[in-house]
């Protein structure tokens, strides 16, 4: 079957999810592709507890997450509702800044050096984090 009951090699298990932390950088779309080919997705942060877990692993390094507004509104890659969900933006962010001179604004979200979020140019080669959920059936204790 396609169910995952434990995390693959090089992945870290936390709260019934598996996380993979890159050591190099890719543009957001390339990082997104990478996670998909792992049957996973760029990390979706749904709580302060998850934010702290990811932050602890990535350290003070710009790192992509699965949040973007390339098609207008901000969206999480797994469909988690943005408006009602957890947010941890830096003050004054997101600002869709055009002053970088690279063309266009800023449509992809990343963890900054202090863990808070910023929107940036999607082409920047930042590290990234993949996440995949463990099979829900495997969460239930076996029947006695």
């Amino acid at each position: 079957g396609s169910e995952r009951t434990c995390c693959p090699v090089n992945w870290v298990e936390h709260e019934r999810s598996c996380y993979w932390f890159s050591r190099s950088g890719k543009a957001w779309a390339d990082a997104d592709n990478y996670c998909r080919l792992e049957d996973a997705h760029l990390v979706v942060v749904t709580s302060w507890e998850e934010q702290k877990f990811v932050q602890r692993h990535i350290g003070p390094v710009n790192t992509w997450m699965g949040l973007h507004d390339q098609n207008g509104p901000w969206k999480w890659v797994d469909g988690t509702d943005y408006e009602t969900g957890f947010k941890n933006w830096r003050p004054e962010q997101p600002d869709d800044w055009y002053g970088h001179g690279l063309g266009g604004g800023e449509d992809c979200a990343h963890f900054t050096d202090d863990g808070r979020w910023n929107d940036d140019v999607c082409q920047r080669p930042y590290r990234w984090v993949c996440e995949t959920e463990l099979d829900k059936a495997s969460q239930e204790p076996p029947l006695l």
Epitope: S24, N33, Y34, L37, D39
Partner: antibody, heavy 121, light 107 residues
Amino acid sequence: QVQLVESGGGVVQPGRSLRLSCAASGFTFSSYGMHWVRQTPGKGLEWVAIISYVGKNKYYADSVKGRFTISRDNSKNTLYLQMNSLRAEDTAVYYCARRGNSYGGYGMDVWGQGTTVTVSS
Amino acid sequence: DIQMTQSPSSRSASVGDRVTITCQASQDISNYLNWCQQKPGKALKLLIYDASTLETGVPSRFSGSGSGTDFTFTISSVQPEDIATYYCQQYDNVPITFGQGTRLEIK
């Protein structure tokens, strides 16, 4: 030992279809992404497609997008390449290859011997 | 797409010679580079991955170096069985792309 064996090649007319198979043995097939790559004397090695472990996610070279479909059956340890609307320029030796476990990349670490596809009227 | 420029396209060497092949990527690919060997009628064989890591079972006369855009593959002392075509391959991003190949002949 780890082995990949391609089959299904042959001579086919332009516009027709062909399905290639790749039988895997000697490793846990469902734990690896898989590729198809082709080789022609003129263009050298050309990557064709990649599929994830479970088969949920796939990517294709622009030259085959919309015509070729990569798929897998993990219960049979087999990778497939369905090739439709074949063109003369699809003539090549087709290899399946295992995606290695390089940290953060898509590289191939094991290759099959290849199967030859000739598209000709 | 990332272009891979490999040189030379062919090389003739004597047994015991040191042979170097270079590969240049059109953009930064970190260390996501393989070197493969293809002998006539045989499957391709991975020799070096992650630019410099020797695949298990591959003789130590083969080595690789480089990062970013410039990479080098070296055979420190060519043996008769090394007659083959050698390819570099970037796997930083899809589409994966290959160098044009270097055909090694023995004098």
